[in-house]
């Protein structure tokens, strides 16, 4: 698809700068830089600076793109399902189902057998089959804590529905705790949400596995009913030690790339000074920004290579997506707020995906 | 950086298939396919199939990668800040601050001036500066609804802290409602979380803008205090009509690409049959999967091109990240659960990022 040449770093930087020139105008839907002829003299109005700073603060607190996946996410996860302890178990006697709560207990030894170390756990979900629901219901999930107290985990607003539907709650942190503690039985509570004013909230939602059934129906239901369960995804124990080995994949981010001599795909430093690099005076804040860019080969790995075990270890770094022609591209990106004038009016606008924080072979 | 040749589609497919061979083994950390010598005859055990189906269901309900950003996300957002209506306004008289709630009201005409149409709103946040906090506090945010009722929006578990900190709540949907309704004043309530059992929950957290201050301190506080505000990001009104124009960016996904003759970057169809394409019998479920792949040029756009307005419209499609050498790579990916045997033991494992759903120039 392509033939490699020696990379002219200066040409790449020039092309990136020219591309940014077009990108900014394109994002603002401007055919040309706005004229500065009407801009009032003096500093930016205080209110505009306050707004710009608010936007900058917002950016500082959250990355626009998801974090790069940790190395463990590349590898296959073994899937395990642990069903809820049957409701006739004595553990349920201590926790009478009230009008606003139902309780679900799980045998942690089953989980521990599948996931011997907490660090191996990648994701755990509590899955409940909710039956048809006549009214909107706001439910909360709690985790059983020591001395019979309950710790709030999350909530869900359930829309009315005529058909059953699986609900899934992310309980990764909780299951990780269970695995690191010694307990045998651990539990969840699903409750109606109560506000401090109204106290009469009843749990309207029926969860499969708790219905009252009689006679033959009961045994059929038991056989076929899809009771609450925990679905766990974990790295198999035998692969765990390799996670900490020298072969682990690096994050191709600014921390690593700016301080290394990496020749392969990496994020490269590039500061754009609006005035010097683009000849622009019309962006009043900031004066420039760290745009950065991705550069470096992503060698295609021939899986028929005889040194196969070595080759496999390289996949994660150089071709995790099994592309026919892997390419070094941005992974984590961040937005850039700017202040500029249109006529006499100062504007604060946020441009998405402007700063390259890390790269990946894709 | 690269010189283009005519693309040999069959070679690309072969390279993709070979890459997948290595990718799957690499994800499973296997140096070679597992032997099938000990696999018991007959169909897969029911429990294993049930587990495989659970995993498949989970995948159906959620994509591993974020959704491709809508076209509007590419363009700059104008940022506006609307401060809370001052607490001496008569609106607050109807809502006495209780021990478990504080109220915040906003003038929607200010918002409507900045964002004339609800569809233009991209994101809105309610931002509150919380002062130091001695104990953990679980708070809930409510939206004022018609007839003085309150609708639950979200909650936050606040950790104890010695320093002030901005809290941010996503209120995009709420502000969109405000913009489409005719109201003048709209509001939020921040309350302590109450469970159905305990009734004594007091709001311990101090939010800047509600403290009782006297004398000179009060006027200083008023001037410098950072009161609650709504931060709105929206497409400028004058750019709105262009959103619906013929030039809009296509999602380079299976829906579009499989039914078009697009020569540029697009997702291309590729079904991998484990037995036929890879010569593998060891994966028991599924028999194959739609791996797909990305292919097609992402023309580098010279921003100095004279036909500039046409060029700018192409940026969003061909080089949204302003790369020096844009490349056609996967955007949305999905996982693949598989069933295979290790010795006599069946395993259900999930492989991340195996199915290419859409592509992008990056």
């Amino acid at each position: 698809l392509s033939t490699c040449k020696t990379i002219d770093m200066e040409l790449v930087k020039r092309k990136r700068i020219e591309a940014i020139r077009g990108q900014i105008l394109s994002k603002l839907r401007l055919a040309s830089p706005p004229s500065q002829g009407e801009v009032p003299p003096g500093p930016l109005p205080e209110a505009v600076l306050a707004l710009y700073n608010s936007t900058r603060d917002r950016v500082a607190g959250e990355s626009a793109e998801p974090e790069p996946e940790p190395e463990a996410d590349y590898y296959a996860k073994e899937v395990t399902r642990v069903l809820m302890v049957e409701t006739h178990n004595e553990i349920y006697d201590k926790f009478k189902q009230s009008t606003h709560s139902i309780y679900m207990f799980f045998n942690t030894s089953e989980l521990r057998e599948a996931v011997p170390e907490p660090v191996l756990l990648s994701r755990a979900e509590l899955r409940l089959l909710r039956l048809k629901l006549k009214v909107e219901q706001h439910v909360e999930l709690y985790q059983k804590y020591s001395n019979n107290s309950w710790r709030y985990l999350s909530n869900r607003l359930l829309a009315p529905s005529d058909s059953p539907e699986w609900l899934s709650f992310d309980v990764t942190g909780v299951v990780r705790q269970w695995l690191s503690r010694g307990g045998e039985i651990e539990g969840f509570r699903l409750s109606a949400h109560c506000s401090c004013d109204s106290r009469d909230n009843t749990l309207q939602v029926d969860i499969n596995g708790f219905e009252q059934q009689r006679g033959d129906m009961q045994s059929i239901a038991k056989k076929h009913r899809r009771v609450p369960y925990v679905l766990a995804m974990a790295l198999p124990a035998e692969r765990a030690n390799e996670l900490h080995s020298a072969r682990r994949r690096r994050d191709l981010d600014t921390d690593y790339c700016f301080s290394s001599t990496e020749k392969n795909c990496c994020v490269r430093q590039l500061y754009i000074d609006f005035r010097k690099d683009l000849g622009w005076k019309w962006i009043h804040e900031p004066k420039g920004y760290h745009a950065n860019f991705c550069l470096g080969p992503c060698p295609y790995i021939w899986s028929l290579d005889t040194q196969y075990s070595k080759v496999l270890a390289l996949y994660n770094q150089h071709n995790p997506g099994a592309s026919a022609a892997p390419c070094c591209v941005p992974q984590a990106l961040e937005p850039l707020p700017i202040v500029y004038y249109v006529g006499r009016k100062p504007k604060v606008e946020q441009l998405s995906n402007m700063i390259v924080r890390s790269c990946k072979c894709s | 950086l690269s010189t283009c040749k005519t693309i040999d589609m069959e070679l690309v497919k072969r390279k993709r298939i070979e890459a997948i061979r290595g990718q799957i083994l690499s994800k499973l950390r296997l140096a070679s396919p597992p032997s099938q010598g000990e696999v018991p005859p007959g169909p897969l055990p029911e429990a294993v199939l049930a587990l495989y189906n659970s995993t498949r269901d989970r995948v159906a309900g959620e994509s591993a990668e974020p959704e491709p950003e809508p076209e509007a996300d590419y363009y700059a957002k104008e940022v506006t800040r609307v401060l809370m209506v001052e607490t001496h306004n008569e609106i607050y008289d109807k809502f006495k601050q209780s021990t478990h709630s504080i109220y915040m009201f906003f003038n929607t005409s200010e918002l409507r001036e900045a964002v004339p149409e609800p569809v233009l709103l991209s994101r809105a946040e309610l931002r509150l500066l919380r002062l130091k906090l001695k104990v953990e506090q679980h708070v809930e945010l409510y939206q004022k609804y018609s007839n003085n009722s309150w609708r639950y929006l979200s909650n936050r578990l606040l950790a104890p802290s010695d320093s002030p900190e901005w809290l941010s709540f996503d209120v995009t949907g709420v502000v969109r409602q405000w913009l489409s309704r005719g109201g003048e004043i709209e509001g939020f309530r921040l309350s302590a979380h109450c469970s159905c059992d305990s009734r004594d929950n007091t709001l311990q957290v101090d939010i800047n803008g509600f403290e009782q201050q006297r004398g000179d301190m009060q006027s200083i506080a008023k001037k410098h205090r950072r009161v609650p505000y709504v931060l709105a990001m929206a497409l400028p009104a004058e750019r709105a009509n262009e959103l619906h124009s013929a030039r809009r960016r296509r999602d380079l996904d299976t829906d579009y690409c499989f039914s078009s003759t697009e020569k540029n970057c697009c997702v291309r169809q590729l079904y991998i049959d484990f037995r036929k394409d890879l010569g593998w019998k060891w994966i028991h479920e599924p028999k194959g999967y739609h791996a797909n792949f990305c292919l097609g040029p992402c023309p580098y756009i010279w921003s100095l091109d004279t036909q500039y307005s046409k060029v700018l419209a192409l940026y969003n499609q061909h080089n949204p990240g302003a790369s020096a050498a844009p490349c056609c790579v996967p955007q949305a990916l999905e996982p693949l659960p598989i069933v295979y045997y290790v010795g006599r033991k069946p395993k259900v494992e999930q492989l991340s990022n195996m199915i290419v759903r859409s592509c992008k120039c990056s």
Epitope: A31, P34, S35, K281 | T306
Partner: antibody, heavy 120, light 107 residues
Framework: EVKLVESGGGLVQPGGSLSLSCAAS????????MSWVRQPPGKALEWLGF??????????EYSASVKGRFTISRDNSQSILYLQMNVLRAEDSATYYC???????????WGQGTTLTVSS | DIQMTQTTSSLSASLGDRLTISCRAS??????LNWYQQKPDGTVKLLIY???RLHSGVPSRFSGSGSGTDYSLTISNLEQADIATYFC?????????FGGGTKLEIK
């Protein structure tokens, strides 16, 4: 298609007044600054002033040569631009163009012009 | 005010020729330089904005270049339809000002 059509030109005595109109179509009138430019016979073009768009509050800006005598206004409901000219002088004789102004510092569409002659 | 000077007030050329019209500003105008064409019937059209960007519908035989204070308009492969007067205009600083114009005639 963007279209600008001027009208109202004619012969006026020195010290007199006249109002020129410019009917706009084919674009969202309130989104744009609108400008007047004139050209005396055989001479260069001269920018007279503009009226800003809605986001900029429809405020006006004039060149020193006409400030105080000429007034630019707009009727947004009818998409019409006006130039009210008072205390006219012989040197105001020219072809008057209305033009759509963009924030990039240029006039992207022009009318065909209307001629004013100031003479006794 | 910024003065715009077009030193050549008239220019004679043959059909098919390549010719350049220049314009100088009295101070740096940061590329905010635009070119207009005025036909003999008085019709005015924008050709180029921001030094080198072609307005929609303008043939690609027109091109612009320059920076700082010196700018030029080039017409390659001159056609009969190009017979007109060409004005430059700065959009950097109010008041906007125009050059004196360059009248193009056929030899």
């Amino acid at each position: 298609e963007v279209k600008l059509v001027e009208s109202g030109g004619g012969l006026v005595q020195p010290g007199g007044s006249l109002s020129l109109s410019c009917a706009a179509s084919g674009f969202t009138f309130t989104d744009y600054y609108m400008s007047w430019v004139r050209q005396p016979p055989g001479k260069a073009l001269e920018w007279l002033g503009f009226i800003r768009n809605k986001p900029n509050g429809y405020t006006t800006e004039y060149s020193a040569s006409v400030k105080g005598r000429f007034t630019i206004s707009r009727d947004n409901s009818q998409s019409i631009l006006y130039l009210q000219m008072n205390v006219l002088r012989a040197e105001d004789s020219a072809t008057y163009y209305c033009a759509r102004y963009t924030g990039g510092g240029y006039f992207d569409y022009w009318g065909q012009g209307t001629t004013l002659t100031v003479s006794s | 005010d910024i003065q715009m000077t077009q030193t050549t007030s008239s220019l004679s050329a043959s059909l098919g020729d390549r010719l350049t019209i220049s314009c100088r500003a009295s101070q740096d105008i940061s590329n905010y330089l635009n070119w207009y064409q005025q036909k003999p019937d008085g019709t005015v059209k924008l050709l180029i904005y921001y030094t080198s960007r072609l307005h929609s519908g303008v043939p690609s035989r027109f091109s612009g270049s320059g920076s700082g204070t010196d700018y030029s308009l080039t017409i390659s492969n001159l056609e009969q339809a190009d017979i007109a007067t060409y004005f430059c205009q700065q959009g950097d600083t109010l008041p906007w000002t125009f050059g004196g114009g360059t009248k193009l005639e056929i030899k």
